[in-house]
């Protein structure tokens, strides 16, 4: 014959747990039901009755299977430099990512406590690390041959256009000018961004080179001092 | 002349630890990553990971993260990558390397051989 | 962890003959924003980058390559073949916060 369903509430064997999704009540010595998400104890069970429910009351929420008497609060409304990616629910709480352009310089165990803008890159600089959603972008002076005109937390440097005829060299913080209207090199126009990090899903791809044979010429100019440590502006 | 010189080779048994150095001149170190690659016997490139010189912050490869640790002195100009708890499938050619794929600035290490033999 | 597929894994081809190399992300798009770059490396000598930021050719690098990208593939092109081409060719792509390398493309005389 079948082994008989115990309902709940309903004392376990000796030395067994109780079944998912039901708990073991101190008081009432018994294994009783628990609450859904969405939902919290009402009333907690006795020997003879098993767990009340109740739905949790506006602007709050339980995630789990739970006995709490109390639902617990939503988070604060976000901020004006975050985004809401998750609204609140009865079966969940608000998550605030930080908006593009910042990153979570103060995370908490879901979302962020507080957003910080992403460091730009001043011109002669060029970003050597993209931001994420939870780290700043890293500046680092142009190496000779390349350049960055821009003020911009995406943008990194670019390789000097190869002239004909050079009319101004090009250095860090400026493309090389040429005489002729055909520079040598083919290049897609404008500058080269750096994906704004996405909260959702981390951002992939860029890769990396490989080792010369021989210093191209642009790498034999003489590097002159070295720029200041910090390559950044604060907005 | 911007030059990046390799410390010599390693033999090592299974489960030691190696270090390996890597000294550059001819630039700041501070101004760019200081990345380390790896080739092992007719095999491709496998990235191990990258070292900010200028505060010390480091990037590692998912595989190479419980395993590699890679720091600097920025007053020797010299990066160095440990690689602890060797394994046969460790021996390769390890490369220090300003290749950064935001930068341009495209400069390797000879190489340095660790064999990792019992 | 992410992949970084190459293909082919060996082309053979003749001097004066158009290359394409291919490099494919298993996470999603390559684009122009992703900078897949493009490394050369020949026997014996040490490694060369080619392509940064996608399609940008590194300081020093002929006309003859180009890199260029497409959904979910980075392309470098070599217009026409010289002696010296013949070499290892390797893309990589920054996943976030690490570099993962393709397999590499051996580019053989034919």
């Known amino acids: 014959l079948p082994a008989q369903v115990a309902f709940t509430p309903y004392a376990p064997e000796p030395g067994s747990t109780c079944r998912l999704r039901e708990y073991y009540d101190q008081t009432a010595q018994m294994c009783c039901s628990k609450c859904s998400p969405g939902q919290h104890a009402k009333v907690f069970c006795t020997k003879t009755s098993d767990t009340v429910c109740d739905s949790c009351e506006d602007s709050t929420y339980t995630q789990l299977w739970n006995w709490v008497p109390e639902c617990l609060s939503c988070g604060s409304r976000c901020s004006s430099d975050q985004v809401e990616t998750q609204a609140c629910t009865r079966e969940q709480n608000r998550i605030c990512t930080c908006r593009p352009g910042w990153y979570c310089a103060l995370s908490k165990q879901e979302g962020c406590r507080l957003c910080a803008p992403l460091r730009k890159c001043r011109p002669g600089f060029g970003v050597a690390r993209p931001g994420t959603e939870t780290s700043d972008v890293v500046c680092k002076p142009c190496a000779p041959g390349t350049f960055s005109n821009t003020t911009s937390s995406t943008d990194i440097c670019r390789p000097h256009q190869i002239c004909n005829v050079v009319a101004i060299p090009g250095n860090a913080s400026m493309d090389a000018v040429c005489t002729s209207t055909s520079p040598t090199r083919s290049m897609a126009p404008g500058a080269v961004h750096l994906p704004q990090p996405v909260s959702t899903r981390s951002q992939h791809t860029q890769p990396t080179p490989e080792p010369s044979t021989a210093p191209s010429t642009s790498f034999l100019l003489p590097m002159g001092p070295s720029p200041p440590a910090e390559g950044s502006t604060g907005d | 002349e911007v030059q990046l010189v390799q410390s010599g080779a390693e033999v090592k048994k299974p489960g030691a630890s190696v270090k390996l150095s890597c000294t550059v001149s001819g630039f700041n170190i501070k101004d760019f990553y200081i990345h380390w690659v790896r080739q092992a016997p007719g095999q491709g490139l496998e990235w191990i990971g990258r070292v900010d010189p200028e505060d010390g912050n480091t990037e590692y490869a998912p595989n190479f993260q419980d395993r590699a640790t890679m720091t600097t002195d920025t007053s020797t100009n010299t990066a160095y990558l440990e690689l602890s708890s060797l394994r046969s499938e460790d021996t390769a050619v390890y490369y220090c390397?300003?290749?950064?794929?935001?930068?341009?600035?495209?400069?390797w290490g000879q190489g340095t051989t660790v064999t990792v033999s019992s | 962890e992410a992949v970084v597929t190459q293909s082919p894994a060996t082309l053979s081809l003749s001097p004066g003959e158009r290359a394409t190399l291919s490099c494919r992300s298993s996470t999603g798009p390559v684009t122009t924003n992703n900078y897949a770059n493009w490394v050369q490396q020949k026997p014996g000598q040490a490694f060369r980058g080619l392509i940064g930021?996608?399609?940008d050719r590194a300081p020093g690098i002929p006309a003859r390559f180009s890199g260029s990208g497409s959904g979910t593939d980075t392309t470098l092109t070599i217009s026409s073949l010289q002696p010296e081409d013949f070499a290892v060719y390797y893309c990589?792509?920054?996943?976030?916060?690490?570099?993962?390398f393709g397999g590499g493309t051996k580019l053989e005389i034919k």
């Open positions: 930021g996608t399609n």
């Open positions: 990589a792509l920054w996943y976030r916060n690490h570099w993962v």
């Open positions: 390397s300003t290749w950064d794929g935001f930068s341009y600035f495209d400069y």
